[in-house]
């Protein structure tokens, strides 16, 4: 059998095979050692017994999408049946005091591979044996502790495969320079040690995407905005737009990146080299936000221009350089740059909101019958922007970290936006007061530290903003 007979049905065309050479990967036309690595079709009854105590689940993840030319990383995590785990030696053991369908196990091991490998024979002086090989016959890499690695992972994509020895997690990075754009399929088959052979325990596949568009995400935030995820923001307050380029392998690390913004409010184009920008909308309504990101990324060099036709006889004026039609200075540099673009579009809604809130006065309320430990304090509050519908006060310790009391109540405020909020304080001392005014779309906060005096008529209230 060949690798492509074993590893999935996707058969790339000859063009795909030729144009998607992955560095360090091998052609799936190579022979597969079925004696050491048996092949079972989906639905084969042997899968049921491939692992003691249930089925092993392989979870394949990737950091797709990948900009063409960058590295894409794949990780496979093995999830064992309940009550089973991998120990420090790579053996699979039962968790202590864990009960599964079979009850508590007397044998601590599910698979004691250490014992198997110490027992193995047929090895020469290098520790190599006929069974410590991959499906294509390549020997296992011999680094310290390799015997603790009891799983063989075979990755397969684009008509090529990659073999890796590992534990319950493995990671493979692939350079996408030669990968065709669009969605591609990665398939992984996992084998476990079984004496001097291997047994398949899991298969998993996942789609990854290679793109020539820079993957761009934008987060939008604004002070006083009640819900940052609804794309509704407030008039007359700056919105912070922060661009995140999905580039986990830092392919664009040394690129000059330009951000071209159109905010859709007739303020024209704004070009920046900073990934963060602030913009204030001064009108209510719905606006179309557009961002274009441009980066000069490493890319393939264009083919050299064809040489000019050679004259039939050497011309004296050309001199010895005549054998170099490009001229020395024109030899193409293999580290070429290519402009890559990314786009982001969003529709945002701008509405009125509470822009600012201020405590302009605090007054100790003199009670005719003062409580033993209680002080009433009035906060006179003003606001700008829309009219609030609720007020919340959070009273906490002087560091503003440990909340002691929180109260919210509806308010009815006139257009001048002047209101008095009365709150009770238990005992003297210094308090942090957070006062928030809110409506459907906005939430404006102000804070103050106040000192509540002892109930001594001579003492007065102090406020420090």
């Amino acid at each position: 059998k060949r690798f492509h007979d074993v590893l999935g049905n996707e058969r790339p065309s000859a063009y795909m095979r030729e144009h998607n050479q992955l560095n360090g990967w091998s052609s799936d036309e190579n022979d597969w050692n079925e004696k050491l690595y048996p092949v079972w079709k989906r639905g084969d009854m042997r899968w049921k017994n491939s692992w003691k105590g249930g089925r092993v689940q392989a979870v394949l993840t990737s950091d797709s999408p990948a900009l063409v030319g960058s590295n894409i990383t794949f990780v496979v995590n093995l999830v064992f049946p309940r009550c089973q785990k991998e120990d420090a030696n790579g053996n699979i053991v039962y968790e202590k005091n864990c009960r599964n369908e079979a009850g508590l196990s007397a044998d601590p091991y599910v698979y004691n591979w250490t014992a198997w490998s110490e027992d193995s024979d047929g090895e020469n002086g290098t520790g190599q044996s006929h069974h410590n090989v991959f499906p294509d016959g390549k020997p296992f890499p011999h680094h310290p502790g390799w015997r603790r690695w009891n799983f063989v992972y075979v990755f397969h994509t684009l008509g090529q495969y990659f073999q890796k020895l590992g534990r319950c997690s493995v990671r493979v990075s692939v350079n996408t320079a030669n990968v065709t754009l669009g969605p591609q399929l990665m398939e992984v088959t996992v084998y476990r040690r079984h004496g001097r052979a291997y047994v398949p325990i899991a298969q998993v596949k996942d789609v990854y995407v290679v793109t020539d568009q820079i993957p761009v995400f934008v987060t939008m935030s604004q002070k006083n905005d009640r819900n940052s995820s609804d794309e509704t923001f407030l008039k007359d307050l700056p919105i912070t737009f922060d661009v995140l380029i999905h580039d986990p392998s830092h392919f664009l690390n040394y690129s000059t990146i330009n951000y071209k913004w159109s905010f859709g409010d007739n303020t024209g184009l704004f070009v920046s080299i900073n990934h963060t920008v602030n913009h204030t909308y001064v009108l209510n309504g719905t606006f179309s936000l557009n961002l274009t990101v441009k980066a000069a990324a490493p890319g393939p060099c264009p083919p050299p221009p064809p040489p000019p036709p050679r004259p039939p006889k050497p011309t004296p004026s050309l001199g010895p350089a005549g054998d170099n039609p490009l001229g020395l200075s024109e030899i193409p540099d293999e580290n070429c740059q290519i402009n890559r673009y990314g786009h982001f579009q969003a529709t945002i809604t701008i509405v009125e909101g509470i822009l600012e809130v201020n405590i302009i006065q605090t007054t100790d309320v003199l009670m005719l019958v003062p409580g033993p430990d209680s002080s009433l304090i009035d906060f006179v509050v003003t606001c700008q922007g829309s009219i609030p519908t609720e007020v919340c006060t959070i009273i906490s310790d002087p560091t503003c970290e440990i909340t002691q009391n929180a109260v919210c109540s509806p308010v009815d405020v006139d257009e001048m936006c002047l209101l008095t909020v009365r709150r009770a304080f238990n005992g003297s001392g210094t308090y942090c007061v957070n006062l928030t005014l809110g409506d459907d779309t906005s939430l404006a906060l102000t804070s103050t530290l106040i000192s509540v005096p002892d109930r001594d008529p001579a003492s007065s209230l102090r406020m420090a903003n």
Partner: antibody, heavy 116, light 108 residues
């Protein structure tokens, strides 16, 4: 015995660059990923990125705005992290740590102070 | 990215007591979780990996449990050398592998 020996403390000005080293001994350097983790004063740990010393391929944490470049010198079994365009927010203890996907041995840490 | 939330942020206990620290993941991470211990002014040290497996040389009074999104680290019969900070970290899927906010364990 596995050991990761990091370079000494650094005091640099905002906008400058710094290169921290981590010399590995007691194991085969190219067999394990080398990670870099930072810890701002009194804060939690943040993974910066890792490098595969075998071929030099690196992966970074995009969520933290650290301008880091990871490199290795296989001949001296040393990993390096260069930090550029430093600001006061980059002041922290920087650790190198071995292995993937969790870290079984850590360097002693390099304290970086960015101050004018 | 997967977020890790650790609680409590700090806790006081006496030698001989048993304490439990919890860690919650924002999505299913199966059993791919580690715990580290960090003493004041020192580097973190690996305690537990794969949620339940004790690292080499870690005393058996430490035990990890949980899977999916909820995890805990239990320290039975606290010893003086156990005081310090503890961090959880997931190791599922592709990087970044985020840490919890930490739990500071102090002597009462």
């Amino acid at each position: 015995e596995v050991q990761l020996q990091q370079s000494g403390p650094e005091l640099v000005k905002p906008g400058a660059s710094v290169k921290i080293s981590c010399k590995a001994s007691g194991y085969t350097f190219t067999d394990y990923y080398m990670n870099w983790v930072r810890q701002s004063h009194g804060k939690s740990l943040e993974w910066i990125g890792d490098i595969n010393p075998y071929h030099g391929g690196s992966t970074y944490n995009q969520k933290i705005k650290v301008k880091a470049t990871l490199t290795v010198d296989k001949s001296s079994s040393t990993a390096y992290m260069e930090l550029r365009s430093l600001t006061s927010e980059d002041s922290a203890v920087y650790y190198c740590a071995r292995n993937w996907p969790y870290f079984d041995y850590w360097g002693q840490g390099t304290t970086l102070t960015v101050s004018s | 990215d997967i977020q890790m939330t650790q609680s409590p942020a700090s806790l006081s206990a006496s030698v001989g007591e048993t304490v439990t620290i919890t860690c919650r993941a924002s999505e299913n991470i199966y059993s791919f979780l580690v715990w580290y211990q960090q003493k004041q002014g020192k580097s973190p040290q690996l305690l537990v990996y794969n949620a339940k497996t004790l690292a080499e040389g870690v005393p058996s009074r430490f035990s990890g449990s949980g899977s999916g999104t909820q995890f805990s680290l239990k320290i039975s019969s606290l010893q003086p050398e156990d005081f310090g900070s503890y961090y959880c970290q997931h190791h599922f899927g592709t990087p970044p592998y985020t840490f919890g906010g930490g739990t500071k364990l102090e002597i009462k």
